[in-house]
Amino acid sequence: RTTTCFGDGCQNTASRCKNGGTWDGLKCQCPNLYYGELCEEVVSSIDIGPPETISAQMELTVTVTSVKFTEELKNHSSQEFQEFKQTFTEQMNIVYSGIPEYVGVNITKLRLGSVVVEHDVLLRTKYTPEYKTVLDNATEVVKEKITKVTTQQIMINDICSDMMCFNTTGTQVQNITVTQYDPEEDCRKMAKEYGDYFVVEYRDQKPYCISPCEPGFSVSKNCNLGKCQMSLSGPQCLCVTTETHWYSGETCNQGTQKSLVYGHHHHHH
């Protein structure tokens, strides 16, 4: 948020940028939370996303029996490791085909025991408020598919007739991590010292991080003819003075007619 300044007063403005604003030669460049000529005003809404996609990571272990472990497989930059990675990835892409959330696999470690493959299965889905359910379902299908393939693709008489064969009992799901998206937490963090006064409200399933100074929401503060301004003690109404009236009160709803004051009378409406 930027406000441009022209003329002789600009040099003075430069040293007066507030709230961490920086002078760029023309104007105060304000940090995210502030705006105004001197970055003196607090914004009334903060963009908190949501992210376009949400990811999940499943830590799995499978035992490949159709490949004998060799020392070279410990070295991730060896040709042997690269070839194993390629074949394993191709095999897993076949196993998990049909899972729209499936992104790929990432081998973290290969160790002895035929070849024990510690790896992550990566999942991703478009953000919707139901993303947790979508990813929970996908992780269940991953478990089903890997269990099925490691039961079916097995060595017979020490020979494998598939791209890879597995040890049925060597399949384990260690851990499942879903990227947490917490709009309330994000809102509080991004509002910094004003966090107590910003809340999340939903519109068309999209979260909005707003202060009561943002109009059009259930928490919005009605300042009538005044202006809502955020301070460290919360939202306050700054009341205006017109040619004919002074306005006062917490929501600037009390108007005092100037002519009556000058005539030493008070009239409220």
């Epitope: 159709s66 490949v67 060799t70 070279e72 042997e80 060595m155 007739s161």
Partner: nanobody
């Protein structure tokens, strides 16, 4: 870069013999697995035999006792000695290799391939 060159194919009468060879360049000959596959017209490529770096061998049931796979690590060469050939052995024969110690006869597990050499067995 690994390159495989198969040769030795030809036409032979039923009961005859052929010796196929496969020269490997850029392949660490003392490691991994080398194999022979074949493909008859209109059929899938099938594993014939493979040999590991330690000399362990395995054969398809249909060729056991008739075919012998061997490799010379010093010469980086793979061979397939085929005896008592039958008309059903007819097809294009390919050599394949993997840097891994494999125990599979599935073609998808082998990343390196030579061009084929044709074997025709007539009755």
């Amino acid at each position: 870069d690994v390159q495989l060159q198969a040769s030795g194919g030809g036409s032979v009468q039923s009961g005859g013999s052929l010796r196929l060879s496969c020269a490997a360049s850029g392949f660490p000959s003392s490691r991994g697995t080398m194999a022979w596959f074949r493909q008859a017209p209109g059929r899938e490529r099938e594993g014939v035999a493979f040999i590991n770096s330690d000399g362990r061998t395995s054969y398809a049931e249909s060729v056991k006792g008739r075919f012998t796979i061997s490799r010379d690590n010093a010469l980086s060469t793979l061979w397939l000695q085929m005896n008592s050939l039958k008309p059903e052995d007819t097809g294009m024969y390919y050599c394949a290799a993997s840097l891994l110690y494999l125990m599979t006869v599935n073609a998808a597990a082998y990343p390196y391939w030579g061009q084929g050499t044709q074997v025709t067995v007539s009755s």
